[in-house]
């Protein structure tokens, strides 16, 4: 049984300084651990590359909104 207390924590220490096209993005996850120095978003691209981004930036927020909409279940 894995020990959750010792589970590794992923942190972002630097953010991308380039805006990523939403067409290249597949998903995102938040980094909110108090063990990390920065609040962050990790985008996963369609080629499975992970990129750290600053959640304070508008393009990051807009990209999260775009990805959220793709999770909607169509209404019948």
């Amino acid at each position: 049984q894995p020990d959750a207390i010792n589970a590794p924590v992923t942190c972002c220490y630097n953010f991308t300084n380039r805006k990523i096209s939403v067409q290249r993005l597949a998903s995102y996850r938040r980094i909110t651990s108090s063990k990390c120095p920065k609040e962050a978003v990790i985008f996963k691209t369609i080629v499975a590359k992970e990129i750290c981004a600053d959640p304070k930036q508008k393009w990051v927020q807009d990209s999260m909104d775009h990805l959220d909409k793709q999770t909607q279940t169509p209404k019948t």
Epitope: S27, Y28, R29, R30, T32, E39, V41, P55, K56, V60, Q61, D62, M64, D65, L67, D68, K69, T71, Q72, T73
Partner: nanobody, 123 residues
């Protein structure tokens, strides 16, 4: 860590209006999708409405469409729910929630929750 505090609940007669507010602190408010959920006595918590980070997209459960309006002020770290033409069936504890995770309107998509505010609609 995001903290959420709701206010504005109360007792209102059927056909009346209430405006709920939710004040957020901690984290970057404009980076969270915000939602309102409600839980009536003896029932499961259910989605009411949500608003995207930009405020440009909203969604509502069918039973409140045309009566409820969600809005947000990213400068003031607040999200509001204007409730008009209230019905006894709207009686519930209303919860403000913040979503950092990818998703839409499922409870599991929301990471942070307020303590709730009671709305009672009498006939």
């Amino acid at each position: 860590e995001v903290q959420l505090v709701e206010s504005g609940g109360g007792l209102v007669q059927a056909g009346g209006s209430l405006r709920l507010s939710c004040a957020a602190s901690g984290g970057t408010f404009s980076s969270y999708r915000m939602g309102w959920f409600r839980q009536a006595p003896g029932k499961e918590r259910e989605f009411v409405t949500l608003i995207s980070r930009s405020g440009g997209t909203t969604d509502y459960t069918d039973s409140v469409k045309g009566r409820f309006t969600i809005s947000r002020d990213n400068a003031k770290n607040t999200v509001s729910l204007q409730m008009n033409n209230l019905k006894p069936a709207d009686t519930a504890v209303y919860y403000c929630a913040a979503a950092g995770s990818m998703g839409w309107n499922h409870l599991r998509d929301y990471d942070y929750w307020g303590q709730g505010t009671q709305v009672t609609v009498s006939s």
